[in-house]
């Protein structure tokens, strides 16, 4: 807390300058009127304070806006930004993109912050839901945004949303997510046609269920096997050796080099060998001829 | 409910074999969602995987163990059985038999018995 | 072998507090992995499988997240039954364990 004391004579500032850098902490306090500092916040950032004086800066706001800055103000807040607390941003309303832009442009590079990632649900929770244009402006600065959502919060995305989604920005995403993710990305791309709609569609497949693995294996899509590597162990086990072969076309043969990974390994213990030898590509691991292929889980849930 | 329970004898002999014998109730081992496993843990240490058996009798080993690991799989009594062979006292340890499963994760595991390696 | 590097190998905390142990892997593997917790003399539990799904029974206290090859085990509010041992492990390939974290009383 800095004490009031008196601005010295002809140190009243006019205006925010460059002249204020030569200010020692009380003076700026003293002679730097609040009103002033609000209706000029964008001369801030071009001058190089000191990040004590930023404080002072921050103080002389925060007693002027006790419950929260103004939009007009936190537009132009540049650097500041970085001096506020997930509680001082908690306090504000946000509802211009353009604001958002300006204040994720401070961080830029930097990981998320947990004053980012409180602007951000402050801005989202004031929109209703994370419509298209917020989702190209976060997803931009940080491509991992996405997957940094819960299952619930990913609920509010709106199917239309899901085109400005790139697959990079699915990277990190985890099977409860894509779970969510997936119906919303077919409901999206349901209108395109088969190729198109499978290159659309491939980001999302990690949410996707065996019926729709199934109906792809139909349509000569050739998946690659890093798009199958990271399907739902539980959507890849009940497709027949006819099937991953209709689903990989020629890019079945890499099978062979996955065969101790997930989920391939599982897939290849469920399989015939006499199914998986027709293949050619050596693959081991499948049930003998002769062996009963009990699928005993629905009896054990049972019972 | 599952329930694994280990057997087999607390000291073995340097040179010898460890045998040890894991016993399934409350479920069967024929079913295709799970893999039937021996775990490790050397004294105030961590968890080591030494391997696991699949119904059908496919195996898979830890590298640094393979020579010397066998798992099988008695699906009439219900059992899985561990043999390591050439012990040493570093393979004194508890040994843990344990059921994973293939959506999950090691989800049912037995007491654990210790198996003391010594002269 | 796919490597987990665990950290930290120990820690000090309090009853309320929130708890951070991270795990990394060598590779990538998806999301092929699970969390488990320890107490002296008895076999490890399964909490966390999948990175980020809770095993059924387990407190919502406990939760997991992934970041590339990063993966955290995060206790929101540590009780006084929580004080145990931590491990990860990777089931993409071989499976493999983290070396464990002990959390401890402060």
């Known amino acids: 807390e800095v004490e009031k004391t008196a601005c010295p004579s002809g140190k009243k500032a006019r205006e925010i300058d460059e002249s204020l850098i030569f200010y020692k902490k009380w003076e700026l306090e003293a002679c730097v009127d609040a009103a002033l500092l609000a209706t000029q916040m964008d001369r801030v950032n071009a001058i190089p304070f000191t990040y004590e004086q930023l404080d002072v800066l921050k103080h002389k706001l925060d007693e002027l806006y006790p419950q929260g800055y103004p939009e007009s103000v936190i537009q132009h807040l540049g650097y500041l930004f970085l001096k506020m607390s997930p509680e001082d941003i908690r306090k504000w309303n946000v509802t211009s993109l353009e604001t958002l832009k300006a204040l994720l442009e401070v961080n830029k590079g930097h990981e998320m912050s947990p004053q980012v990632a409180t602007l951000i649900d402050r801005f989202v929770k004031g929109r209703g839901q994370l419509d298209k244009d917020t989702l190209d402006t976060l997803t931009a600065f940080y491509p991992g945004y996405l997957c940094s959502l819960s299952p619930e919060e990913l609920s509010s995305v709106p199917p239309s949303s899901i085109w400005a989604v790139r697959p990079q920005d699915l990277d990190t995403c985890d099977p409860r997510q894509l779970d969510v993710l997936y119906p919303k990305a077919r409901l999206a791309f349901q209108n395109m046609n088969g190729s198109e709609y499978f290159v659309k569609i491939q980001s999302f497949l990690g949410g996707a269920p065996t019926e729709d693995l199934k109906a792809l294996s139909q349509q000569n899509v050739s998946m690659d096997l890093a798009t199958f590597m990271k399907l739902r162990t539980d959507a890849v086990l009940p497709l027949t050796v006819a099937e991953v072969q209709k689903l990989l076309g020629p890019h079945v043969e890499g099978l062979k080099a996955e065969e101790r990974h997930r989920p391939v390994r599982d897939w290849i213990l469920r399989q015939r060998q006499d199914d998986l030898d027709t293949l050619g590509l050596g693959l081991q691991g499948g049930i003998p001829n002769g062996y009963l292929v009990l699928d005993l889980s629905m009896q054990e849930a049972l019972s | 409910q599952v329930q694994l329970q280990e057997s087999g004898p607390g000291l073995v002999k340097p040179s010898q074999t460890l045998s040890l014998t894991c016993t399934v109730s409350?479920?069967?081992?024929?079913?295709?969602?799970?893999?039937w496993t021996w775990i490790r843990q050397h004294p105030g240490k961590g968890l080591e995987w030494i391997g696991y058996?699949?119904?059908?009798?496919?195996?898979f080993y830890n590298p640094s163990l393979k020579s010397r690991v066998t798992i099988s799989v008695d699906t009439s009594k219900t059992q899985f059985s561990l043999k390591l062979s050439s012990v040493t006292a570093a393979d004194t340890a508890v040994y843990y038999c344990?059921?994973?499963?293939?959506?999950?994760?090691?989800?049912?595991w037995g007491q654990g018995t210790l198996v003391t390696v010594s002269s | 072998d796919i490597q987990m590097t665990q950290s930290p190998s120990s820690l000090s905390a309090s009853v309320g507090d929130r708890v951070t142990i991270t795990c990394r892997a060598s590779?990538?593997?998806?999301?092929?992995l699970n969390w488990y917790q320890q107490k002296p003399g008895k076999a490890p539990t399964l909490l966390i499988y999948?990175?980020?799904s809770l095993q059924s029974g387990v407190p919502s206290r406990f939760s997991g997240s992934r970041s590339g090859t990063d993966f955290t085990l995060t206790i929101s509010s540590l009780q006084p039954e929580d004080f145990a041992a931590y491990f990860c492990?990777?089931?993409?390939?071989?499976?493999?364990f983290g070396q464990g974290t002990k959390v401890e009383v402060k």
């Open positions: 058996i699949y119904y059908s009798g496919s195996t």
């Open positions: 344990a059921r994973e499963d293939t959506m999950t994760g090691l989800d049912v």
């Open positions: 999948a990175a980020s």
């Open positions: 409350g479920g069967s081992i024929n079913n295709n969602n799970y893999y």
């Open positions: 492990q990777q089931t993409y390939s071989n499976p493999t």
């Open positions: 590779q990538s593997i998806n999301n092929y």
